[in-house]
């Protein structure tokens, strides 16, 4: 028996508006009805929780109102979007999936998505 497998892309480049999206897919060993998804960021030997959501299979992911994350779920796939990113937010973003209910509990952790964020150049002053 091994840890639950979680797949996510290796690299994502955030848009010029500071938005990055990626898919987190997990191989569920059972028929989970309640799933918790957490996005963690590892950078400079620090680990921080970016956002987390618990959802019932077939329902929408609900993040806290002040969360920088949004997402949708489809089967064993979660489509995650992180907003408001700046260059200093560049780092490894890890998808953690926990099958909460029904028992048994399972934990899976992806290998991380390196998100690169480039701050846009300020627009030059225009005479027009």
């Amino acid at each position: 028996c091994k840890a639950m497998h979680v797949a996510q892309p290796a690299v994502v480049l955030a848009s010029s508006r500071g938005i990055a999206s990626f898919v987190c897919e997990y191989a569920s060993p059972g028929k989970a009805t309640e799933v918790r998804v957490t996005v963690l960021r590892q950078a400079d030997s620090q680990v921080t929780e970016v956002c987390a959501a618990t959802y019932m299979m077939g329902n929408e992911l609900t993040f806290l109102d002040d969360s920088i994350c949004t997402g949708t779920s489809s089967g064993n796939q979660v489509n995650l979007t992180i907003q408001g990113l700046r260059a200093m937010d560049t780092g490894l973003y890890i998808c953690k999936v926990e099958l909460m209910y029904p028992p048994p509990y399972y934990l899976g952790i992806g290998n991380g998505t390196q998100i690169y964020v480039i701050d846009p150049e300020p627009c030059p002053d225009s005479d027009f």
Partner: nanobody, 127 residues
Framework: EVQLVESGGGLAQPGGSLRLSCAAS????????IGWFRQAPGKERETVAC??????SYADSVKGRFTISRDNAKNMVYLQMNSLKPEDTAVYYC??????????????????????WTQGTQVTVSS
């Protein structure tokens, strides 16, 4: 799936020793990092130590006093606690995390990466 059960807590005198054990069932320990964590009343849960196939890592507060080890044949992880201090008093938890290539010595013990938490065992250091 992994199931963890810890044992070995209790009362110890300052300067004394205790050994905690964490038994795993349902899976081999090999693909997992096993960590020990503790939580004192009114404080956040904090890392004590963790171990994977080839590395160990310790919180600064326990370095030189606590030793973590694992016996893969018995599916057991141990925490030998020596030179105990009153500030070591807490509920101690064992937990597991899938071992990942991006874990560093500084991050492999981070509680955010863990699951399969045990119920906890009380360790009290008092004269």
């Amino acid at each position: 799936e992994v199931q963890l059960v810890e044992s070995g807590g209790g009362l110890a005198q300052p300067g004394g020793s205790l050994r905690l054990s964490c038994a795993a069932s349902g899976s081999t320990l090999d693909p997992f990092v096993i960590g020990w964590f503790r939580q004192a009343p009114g404080k956040e849960r904090e890392t004590v130590a963790c171990i994977n196939r080839s590395r160990t890592s310790y919180a600064d507060s326990v370095k030189g006093r606590f030793t973590i080890s694992r016996d893969n044949a018995k599916n057991m992880v141990y925490l030998q606690m020596n030179s105990l201090k009153p500030e070591d008093t807490a509920v101690y938890y064992c937990a597991a995390s899938p071992d990942k290539p991006f874990y560093t010595d500084q991050t492999m013990c981070n509680k955010h990466y863990y699951g399969y938490w045990t119920q906890g065992t009380q360790v009290t250091v008092s004269s």
